[in-house]
């Protein structure tokens, strides 16, 4: 697994650099998670042909994965910092159950899957410190999450491969959208 942000060799080589601001830390954390997702996607794509499937075909699934929409205030048109921040945090909290599902889905990248999961928890903490309106953030129900996890793990092999691919792709795209929005803040 890659070293966490702030600890890579390039950072060590610059000991006199100014400490990272909150925004820079968040930015770097997201990029770190995206690198982890890339590694996981490589293993998934090498193992199955899911990555070749068209986005239209993949859209026909029953997963309720978080997605950005105009109303969330994260787009340049109609941008709303507070609404957007709430959406990003809520979305990441909703992704946590899917990241838990990924934990037993990888052979050579098991450590990487764990790193993505743990780094996402850290990212949520960073963002919660930045948010003013924490009351607006809805935390997923643990019981619902537990039953969803059981259901996902009971799928046949083909569906599990499809689910893994969809989670990684959706999480990647959610983070990329978040990154664009956060740089507007």
């Amino acid at each position: 697994a890659p070293v966490p942000p702030g600890e890579d060799s390039k950072d060590v080589a610059a000991p006199h650099r100014q400490p990272l601001t909150s925004s820079e830390r968040i930015d770097k954390q997201i990029r770190y998670i995206l690198d982890g997702i890339s590694a996981l996607r490589k293993e998934t794509c090498n193992k199955s042909n899911m990555c070749e499937s068209s986005k239209e075909a993949l859209a026909e699934n029953n997963l309720n994965l978080p997605k950005m929409a105009e109303k969330d205030g994260c787009f340049q048109s109609g941008f709303n910092e507070e609404t957007c921040l709430v959406k990003i945090i809520t979305g990441l909290l909703e992704f946590e159950v899917y990241l838990e599902y990924l934990q037993n889905r990888f052979e050579s990248s098991e450590e990487q899957a764990r790193a993505v999961q743990m780094s996402t928890k850290v990212l949520i903490q960073f963002l919660q410190k930045k948010a003013k309106n924490l009351d607006a953030i809805t935390t997923p129900d643990p019981t619902t999450n537990a039953s969803l996890l059981t259901k996902l793990q009971a799928q046949n092999q083909w569906l599990q491969d499809m689910t893994t691919h969809l989670i990684l792709r959706s999480f990647k795209e959610f983070l990329q959208s978040s990154l664009r929005a956060l740089r507007q803040m």
Epitope: R31, D35, S38, S54, K55, L175, Q176, S177, R180, R183
Partner: antibody, heavy 120, light 108 residues
């Protein structure tokens, strides 16, 4: 491949729409960007239309001067009220989707460009 | 957003040329380089600061991280005469121009 069309001579203030048509890949799978280049000048990013959420981001200088819209087969760039400063070659480019790119917008396939001349 | 130097450089065939690009804030390794010949469309050379794009000659190499980046062309050939642009990979909020101003390489 990527190809732009619609470039022509227009008078200042006359709206103009440029069209980007692609083949060999699907617009439902790739973000697309518009870049322009004034005669003898450098490349200037205008904006990018993303796939997943359908959001479009523009350079900070755009301020409503351009609008990017996407259909299933084309990506359009509307110059809302052209001025002589908008005289340029307009390029449409695909934003690659390789995992190695991470969060990085890499313009991996470009059209030949279409020339827009704004003059009275 | 991106400052490129020099604006123009002359190099002899077989020589080496170095182009620098500076970002106004840290962009990690999210930087690409493009080559554009007169009257042609730009062509992707490198991405992620140092990774060669498919089909690009190994004469081209890139390095850098954070705010300082370099493109090096070793063993310059006549066909390398072109303008080279760096591009920061963040084209989201608050970006003025994703591209550097360009460096014209003249091969003598």
């Amino acid at each position: 491949s990527v190809e732009e069309s619609g470039g022509r001579l227009v008078t200042p203030g006359t709206p103009l729409t440029l069209t980007c048509t692609v083949s060999g890949f699907s617009l439902s799978s790739y973000a697309m960007t518009w870049v322009r280049q004034a005669p003898g000048k450098g490349l200037e990013w205008i904006g990018t239309s993303y796939v997943y959420s359908g959001d479009t981001w523009y350079a900070s200088w755009v301020k409503g001067r351009f609008t990017i819209s996407k259909t299933s087969t084309t990506v359009d760039l509307k110059i809302t009220s052209p001025t002589t400063e908008d005289t340029a070659t307009y390029f449409c480019a695909r934003v690659g989707d390789y995992d190695d790119y991470g969060a990085h917008d890499v313009f991996d396939s470009w059209g030949p460009g279409t020339l827009v001349t704004v003059s009275s | 957003d991106m400052t490129q130097t020099p604006a123009s450089v002359e190099v002899a065939v077989g020589g080496t040329v170095t182009i620098k690009c500076q970002a106004s804030e840290s962009i990690s390794s999210w930087l690409s380089w493009y080559q554009q010949k007169p009257g042609q469309r730009p062509k992707l050379l490198l991405y992620r600061a140092s990774t060669l794009a498919s089909g690009v000659s190994s004469r081209f190499s890139g390095s850098g991280y954070g705010t300082e980046f370099t493109l090096t062309i070793s063993g310059v050939q006549c066909e390398d005469a072109a303008t080279y642009y760096c591009q920061q990979g963040y084209t989201g909020g608050n970006v003025d121009n994703a591209f550097g101003g360009g460096t014209k390489v003249v091969v003598v």
